[in-house]
Amino acid sequence: EEELQVIQPDKSVSVAAGESAILHCTVTSLIPVGPIQWFRGAGPARELIYNQKEGHFPRVTTVSESTKRENMDFSISISNITPADAGTYYCVKFRKGSPDTEFKSGAGTELSVRAKPS
């Protein structure tokens, strides 16, 4: 069986301030078991945007029913975008454990924020 891949098809997305941004992410396998997390940026300074497992992420909604066992689409929508949201977003698969460990990351999607049209 082929190893899981995390696919972020869009290299970049541009959104006007105040609008919503859709960031696409799919995985190619249900194995290994474990949650998806979204981050803005890479390395230790990265910001947690969404954690499928726990937490309260009011501006983020999942595009599909990510809680379904067979789901492989982990795309998200971020509402009310501001300039501070600009950056590269990574969809990251974790392997279930105590604690969960990072398994594989997508290539990233760069979000740029345009001025709100007047």
Partner: antibody, heavy 119, light 108 residues
Framework: DVQLVESGGGVVRPGESLRLSCAAS????????MNWVRQAPGEGLEWVSR????????DYAESVKGRFTISRDNSENTLYLQMNSLRAEDTAVYYC????????????WGLGALVTVSS | ETVLTQSPATLSVSPGERATLSCRAS??????LAWHQQKPGQAPRLLIY???NRATGIPDRFSGSGSGTDFTLTISSLQTEDSAVYYC??????????FGGGTKVEIK
């Protein structure tokens, strides 16, 4: 219910150090950025520092940069502020504040810890 | 760096009357503005976020309006327990996070 409880305040002399703690409960601490905000006697609110959810990203106000260090222990649900080379102008009540989401407002505040720097 | 200017510095209002507080940003902050209430000797408390949304447990006599650079907090019928300092906070551009200088609401 969300609770934020600061401790570690006190009276110190200029140039000395102090470490504040903020014990958090009632929410998923490791999922939220946290902040320190201070208020000098009779003055308004001044943002001091921010730390991202994982602890690897930090920001500071220019007035404390190089002297204060923010950190967190997600296993203990605790936020810290290490304050070195304290000055009289650092005298204030220090509040820890939870951030609603990573790029958002402060939705819960602690009761505050008083730090007095005086010779 | 965005500067927030609150006016008036002090507002004296009779119980049951309307109080109108203003917060002006030096550049657009979209709808990313919050209002916090601080009663004497207490910690701040979130009242309004995203310019118009009331936080959990906040009475409906508090309302927020505005977008861009001009924002208003309205207390429709002032109660004695509303005596406090009110601060606006922007979170459109950061760091640093900025607060306004505050408006003190006194009961006549």
């Amino acid at each position: 219910d969300v609770q934020l409880v600061e401790s570690g305040g006190g009276v110190v002399r200029p140039g000395e150090s102090l470490r504040l703690s903020c014990a958090a409960s009632g929410f998923s601490f490791s999922s939220h950025a946290m902040n320190w905000v201070r208020q000098a006697p009779g003055e308004g609110l001044e943002w001091v520092s921010r730390i991202n959810s994982g602890g690897g990203g930090t920001d500071y106000a220019e007035s404390v940069k190089g002297r204060f260090t923010i950190s967190r222990d997600n296993s203990e649900n605790t936020l810290y502020l290490q304050m070195n080379s304290l000055r009289a102008e650092d005298t204030a009540v220090y509040y820890c504040a939870k951030q609603y989401d990573w790029n958002g407002f402060f939705d819960y505040w602690g009761l505050g810890a008083l730090v007095t720097v005086s010779s | 760096e965005t500067v927030l200017t609150q006016s008036p510095a002090t507002l004296s209002v009779s119980p049951g009357e309307r109080a109108t507080l203003s917060c002006r940003a030096s550049q657009t902050v979209g709808s990313k503005l919050a209002w916090h209430q601080q009663k004497p000797g207490q910690a701040p408390r979130l009242l309004i976020y995203d310019a118009t949304n009331r936080a959990t447990g906040i009475p409906d006599r508090f309302s927020g309006s505005g977008s861009g650079t001009d924002f208003t907090l309205t207390i429709s019928s002032l109660q004695t327990e509303d005596s406090a300092v009110y601060y606006c906070q922007q979170y459109y551009y950061w760091p640093p996070y900025r607060f306004g200088g505050g408006t003190k609401v006194e009961i006549k």
